[in-house]
């Protein structure tokens, strides 16, 4: 047994529809034959470090990194990825080898990097290093831009790891609110990767290629603004960079800015300050807080304080995975024929969603607007008062969300009739769904007031194309009414509509609309 390797590293590729891939990183089912990654001892390294062969993975592929340890006794372990420690649950296989697994579901850019596994056995300690990268395929991608500080300069670099190479531009605005809309004259665009002018009110970086355009705003706390009722909230995924800018203006230079995380000053190297005089000789100071690759413990309240301004905070939340939070219960609306109305969905999501509105198998563009409370809203007003089912669908890299709406238009029934040898039927799509009456017209009742109750059958059916309800009523023909005129009437709270039918021998039936 001595010549067996102490440690074996394997890669398991899972088929994308493979239901065997569990959410847990303990021991998923093997779906394809494992690929040996070698795991050679790394020379000239302090301690026992094994290095697995580099792993290249397709975007959205699911894999398991697995280590088999042939060592006596119990083992304990810890995974570390981008400075974050991840849960590790070893188990033993039939040959009594310790098995440690890391499942990566739907590979994305943020999951690429070095995975370190620390193993402690009764005999010794090991470190195993896996390097996972995304395979360079011809698939086009467009990644949201992120910021980096330029080495030895007070400037930001905007980076978007996209294929084909995107055009990067800074979008700057120096006024407040609505006037910072994309096409406003207050907006200045600079098609370059490096930005030195970092004192503006609103700073965004956008990247565009054949797939479209993605933007990232520089998260800013402005101490000259009145503190908001709702604390601003910033979401990031583990491994992403954090950038928050604190900005303050004062009549002179006699003030300073500080950043704290949960009441502890940020460590040096996690902030940098810039200041300038504005045109009216007031002093503008900005202080950046930044973390090049966030871990779970970077979550918390980041507070910017000044000796001359009220302090303000932002809640930074680091998540393992993106999310879309919204209520997915379906909603029904009824509106008048000329009433102004919009569907709306309020959601909290990270990363930003891509969305569509769909009606009758036709998709419509979807706009989102950020609200002050950290939520976003998407509205759809272009329904043209067509009743039916409307669907809102949203997705980001990690989550999907669908919500159904039903629109009913209040209107007086419109009746259509059809008949056969044995029965007469009337249909109406008015809303609220109408009730029906059948009346017989005769010498005794020239105004058709004699009600028919026998042989009437009412039903409502869903007209699938638009998801709108149609009500129908059918009268089975009897000897008592054959040869007579009958009238079917549909009525709801908005009015009544009738159709008169002559029940004669088989053949075409004349219908008389009678409103």
């Amino acid at each position: 047994n001595q010549d067996l390797p102490v440690i074996k590293c394997v890669l398991i590729n899972h088929k994308n529809n493979d239901s065997s891939v569990g959410k847990s990183s303990s021991y998923p089912m093997v779906s394809e034959s494992p690929e040996d990654l070698g795991c050679a001892l790394r020379p000239q390294s302090s301690g026992t470090v094994y290095e697995a062969a580099a792993v290249e993975v397709d975007v959205s592929a699911s894999i398991t990194l697995q280590v088999l340890v042939d060592a006596p006794g119990n083992i304990s372990c810890l995974w570390v990825f981008k400075h974050s420690s991840l849960n590790c649950q070893p188990h033993f296989d039939l040959q009594n080898r310790g098995v440690v697994s890391m499942v990566i579901l739907k590979m994305t850019e943020t999951q690429a990097g070095e995975y370190l596994l620390f193993i402690q056995s009764e005999a010794t300690n090991y470190t195993i290093l896996f390097t996972v990268s995304i395979r360079n395929t011809l698939l086009y991608t467009l990644r949201r831009p992120y910021f980096r500080k330029m080495e030895n300069q007070d400037a930001l670099v905007c980076i978007s790891e996209s294929v084909p190479e995107p055009i990067v531009e800074w979008v700057l605005c120096d006024s407040q609110g609505e006037s910072c809309k994309e096409e406003s004259p207050a907006v200045v665009k600079k098609e370059e990767k490096v930005l030195h002018e970092l004192f503006g009110t609103d700073i965004r970086c956008c990247a565009r290629n054949e797939l479209g355009r993605e933007c990232t705003r520089l998260f800013t706390i402005d101490l000259n603004q009145t503190p908001q009722t709702t604390l601003p909230q910033l979401f990031l995924k583990v491994g992403e960079p954090l950038w928050i800018r604190c900005k303050a203006v004062h009549v002179n230079h006699g003030f300073g800015l500080t950043w704290e995380l949960e009441n502890k000053a940020l460590e040096e190297g996690n902030y940098f300050e810039m200041s300038t005089y504005s045109t009216n000789r007031t002093m503008i100071r900005i202080l950046f807080a930044f973390v090049s690759s966030v871990a779970r413990n970077d979550t918390g309240y980041y507070t910017c304080s000044s000796s001359k301004h009220p302090s303000q905070s932002a809640l930074v939340t680091i998540v393992e995975k993106g999310f879309i939070n919204a209520t997915n219960s379906s909603e029904d609306y009824e509106i008048d024929q000329y009433e102004e109305f919009c569907f709306s969905v309020r959601f909290k999501a990270y990363p930003q969603i891509r969305c569509t509105w769909t009606f009758s198998r036709k998709s419509f563009p979807c706009e989102q607007k950020g609200l002050d409370n950290g939520y976003s809203i998407s509205k759809f007003c272009n329904h043209k008062h067509q009743p039916g089912e409307y669907i809102f669908h949203a997705e980001n890299d990690d989550a999907q969300f669908t919500k159904m709406f039903t629109l009913n238009i209040r209107r007086k029934p419109q009746v259509l009739a059809e008949a056969s040898a044995s029965q007469a039927s009337c249909f109406s799509d008015g809303y609220p769904l109408p009730s029906w009456t059948w009346k017989k017209c005769s010498d005794k009742s020239p105004n058709c007031t004699e009600e028919i109750t026998e042989g009437v059958w009412n039903r409502k059916a869903n007209r699938k194309v638009f998801g709108q309800w149609v009500s129908s009523s059918t009268l089975n023909m009897s000897e008592a009414i054959k040869g007579f005129l009958v009238k079917c009437c549909a009525y709801n709270s908005l009015g009544t509509s009738c159709e008169t039918i002559l029940l004669n021998s088989p053949g075409p039936f004349p219908f008389i609309q009678d409103n």
């Epitope: 604390l231 009441n263 309240y301 000796s307 009220p310 905070s313 809640l315």
Partner: nanobody, 111 residues
Framework: QVQLQESGGGLVQAGGSLRLSCAAS????????IDWYRQAPGNEREWVAQ???????FYADSVKGRFAISRDNAKNTVYLQMNSLKPEDTAVYYC?????WGQGTQVTVSS
């Protein structure tokens, strides 16, 4: 569990004074800055004053010179002394620490 409890509200005549208190628990009080906000019927909640953990105070323009904010770290309490009250000061007053809010105390100023 962070809890904030306001007290000291009531009915007062224009020109009169009130002292509001905000008692905090479940938070490192001395390490936190505290804000007072108020909300009049039909209006948005608006910021009134702040005291930093170092004891510096800041005020909205509408209350400057009339209101004074102070803190007693030993009692985990912040106070808002309101003088020369006006009918437009009528509102529910809330204190806040970070994302945490109290239930509010009603202040009514009659003319």
């Amino acid at each position: 569990q962070v809890q904030l409890q306001e007290s000291g509200g009531g009915l007062v005549q224009a020109g009169g004074s009130l002292r509001l208190s905000c008692a905090a628990s479940g938070v490192t009080f001395s390490a936190s800055y505290i804000d007072w906000y108020r909300q009049a019927p039909g209006n948005e909640r608006e910021w009134v004053a702040q005291i930093t953990r170092g004891g510096d105070s800041f005020y909205a323009d509408s209350v400057k010179g009339r209101f004074a904010i102070s803190r007693d770290n030993a009692k985990n309490t912040v106070y808002l002394q309101m003088n020369s009250l006006k009918p437009e000061d009528t509102a529910v007053y809330y204190c806040r620490v970070l994302s945490y809010w109290g239930q509010g105390t009603q202040v009514t100023v009659s003319s």
